[in-house]
Amino acid sequence: DWVVAPISVPENGKGPFPQRLNQLKSNKDRDTKIFYSITGPGADSPPEGVFAVEKETGWLLLNKPLDREEIAKYELFGHAVSENGASVEDPMNISIIVTDQNDHKPKFTQDTFRGSVLEGVLPGTSVMQVTATDEDDAIYTYNGVVAYSIHSQEPKDPHDLMFTIHRSTGTISVISSGLDREKVPEYTLTIQATDMDGDGSTTTAVAVVEILDANDNAPMFEPQKYEAWVPENEVGHEVQRLTVTDLDVPNSPAWRATYHIVGGDDGDHFTITTHPETNQGVLTTKKGLDFEAQDQHTLYVEVTNEAPFAVKLPTATATVVVHVKDVNEAPVFVPPSKVVEVQEGIPTGEPVCVYTAEDPDKENQKISYRILRDPAGWLAMDPDSGQVTAVGTLDREDEQFVRNNIYEVMVLAMDNGSPPTTGTGTLLLTLIDVNDHGPVPEPRQITICNQSPVRQVLNITDKDLSPHTSPFQAQLTDDSDIYWTAEVNEEGDTVVLSLKKFLKQDTYDVHLSLSDHGNKEQLTVIRATVCDCHGHVETCPGPWKGGSGGGGSGAGVIAVIVVVVIAIVAGIVVLVISRKKRMAKYEKAEIKEMGEMHRELNA
């Protein structure tokens, strides 16, 4: 039948490998040649190749020793197909159960277990639990069943059976009375764990049982009076270490000290903590002390333990006299950050503000001032009076130095103490806008058709703030209004430039004057390229002599150089020639316009 009973394979097999386990056999092999295969983890999926099957014979083989502690059971599928690959049987479950061998010793979870119990406790008191694990099977065999025992106890006082261990749980408990910390503060037990429920392999570990002290000794100050000197203003400064002695177990809650300031610190200037190693009380400043306000503090410190006293005990108190040492304190600007409104462009030498500092010290120390950081170099500061004046032109529109209308300056005050100390202040100048910028059109170069031209919309920008901005006004100058019109839109923030008369294809200067709401005027020359075309245009079509062509030849480069030279010469000539000469281009354009009209009429 096409069924295989679960196959049991002992772990750690010695081989040799491949080792035969079972033969898969289909009774369909009478009719046709059968080919066998297996699938599943351990065959064709990880861990691959542990098991294999001979294709023609159906023999199931084991290729390596198994480890039950790694994989305890393999679930494979056996397949049978005919020569043409057609399945002749349903996949068959093959269960391979790895049977356990006692190949692991018990292992304690720790080399050394630590537990504690109060001195004088009654027998039966639980101390601690130890644990040993064994990777072997503890369900179907005793291979992994662990039994605990105590092998030895040191010291053997008052006798050698002070503790017992539960055979199966590993719980150690007190079995005899007489635990006395003053005589024996610690016991060392050698414990054993044995598998096969006590009949197999043994491993050992150590259990250290600390006998805890009852808190029957109060900590005592040694000495009881302290005197300390502390510089003023320092936070976190160690004032004094207070030492105590305690007869209880070192580093136990009954020995560890807890300190409290019980008097003399009405201003909450001090704090006291316990040093984790020395158990001293470390008195430190929580706030800076002020010599000018109080030059001496007398503190009262009380000490107790972390653990409450087991019996009624007197609490020790120490006195600490703290002398405050005077320190030269830094001048302090008032306020630390000063905001001043000042108009941009004020004349050089004009006062901006007075910015001074105060010295916390009692002596009347002399304070001198200087500018520490003035990125644009616009200000000066009088060293004696703290008077800040303008030495450069304050420019609100200078984007390099001014952010959100604010110019930030850092100033320094220095006293004449020994050693001298310094303090800094921040001066924030809020620059008030002045109408010092005229409106400017964008772009300043346009290309336009000379037939059915499209209106050119230019944006108007003004660096100033309202009300020194829009609405803007536009006016054409230098006879540019003969051929062009300029109109500001309703919102007053764009100007529309239109060609109103025919001009031949060429480049022209359009003189546009823009003024803002505060009548600040700015003349801008718009470079207009007029093209022989209709409607909208980006660049002039056809052979255009006015610009540089796209040629890549040497001749083209020479031509460009020639044009540039001519342009420079022409520029010089333009500066010399009169307005009439400048109008010649427009007059020729008029003649050409009339010629065009004449041609159209003849046509």
Partner: antibody, heavy 118, light 107 residues
Framework: VQLVEESGGDLVKPGGSLKLSCAAS????????MSWVRQTPDKRLEWVAT????????YYPDSVKGRFTISRDNAKNTLYLQMSSLKSEDTAMYYC???????????WGQGTTVTVSS | ELQMTQSPSSLSASLGERVSLTCRAS??????LNWLQQKPDGTIKRLIY???SLDSGVPKRFSGSRSGSDYSLTISSLESEDFGDYYC?????????FGAGTKLEIK
């Protein structure tokens, strides 16, 4: 018909290396364990190495462990034996043999001669 | 290492005669034993696997058996092609080990 044919045998100096090949045909090579066996000049047969069908696991006697490596290429239906640190006692006729019916040494090749001599 | 002691080391027999070869295992190997035949040209062939199972194509005059730790190969009636060397090999314990061989000659 199941056929195995060895090649690669040669004369090699002590300490040298050599790689033997065994080409298989006539059976599904990839599902059978394969071994190398050698026959010394005094006619004694000695098992040299075995490899599992998928090539994941290999086994050697102590006499060759660490010096010889058995491997296979199931795509090429070929078994290999890489021999290094050769000694004069490795002189033998080397045969490759397949498992069949879960049992070793079912089908044998003609053998290839390895001579280790200075 | 498990030892396979093969006897006799050589044997002369006549055609038609019944002969038996023996291998003794120094430890238990169960039924994990094969018998091999080597012809004078060096060709090796497996005759018997698992102590007593006959390989396909092997004449029925060959048979294998076991008695305790002794394993036998019997040829019921010798034929001319049966002459050559015969080896046992165990695979019940690692490493696999061979008998020293028996040379079967024509008398």
């Amino acid at each position: 018909v199941q056929l195995v044919e060895e090649s690669g045998g040669d004369l090699v100096k002590p300490g040298g290396s050599l790689k033997l090949s065994c080409a298989a045909s006539g059976f599904t090579f990839s599902t059978y364990g394969m071994s190398w066996v050698r026959q010394t000049p005094d006619k004694r047969l000695e098992w040299v190495a075995t490899i599992s069908s998928g090539g994941h696991y290999s086994y050697y006697p102590d006499s060759v462990k660490g010096r010889f490596t058995i491997s296979r290429d199931n795509a090429k239906n070929t078994l290999y034996l890489q021999m290094s640190s050769l000694k004069s006692e490795d002189t033998a006729m080397y045969y490759c043999a397949s498992y069949y019916y879960g049992s070793p040494f079912a089908y044998w090749g003609q053998g290839t001669t390895v001579t280790v001599s200075s | 290492e498990l030892q396979m002691t093969q006897s006799p080391s050589s044997l002369s027999a006549s055609l038609g005669e019944r002969v038996s070869l023996t291998c003794r295992a120094s430890q238990d190997i169960g039924s994990s034993l094969n018998w091999l035949q080597q012809k004078p040209d060096g060709t090796i062939k497996r005759l018997i696997y698992d102590t007593s199972s006959l390989d396909s194509g092997v004449p029925k005059r060959f048979s294998g058996s076991r008695s305790g730790s002794d394993y036998s190969l019997t040829i019921s009636s010798l034929e001319s092609e049966d002459f050559g060397d015969y080896y046992c090999v165990q695979y019940g314990s690692s490493p696999l080990t061979f008998g020293a061989g028996t040379k079967l000659e024509i008398k």
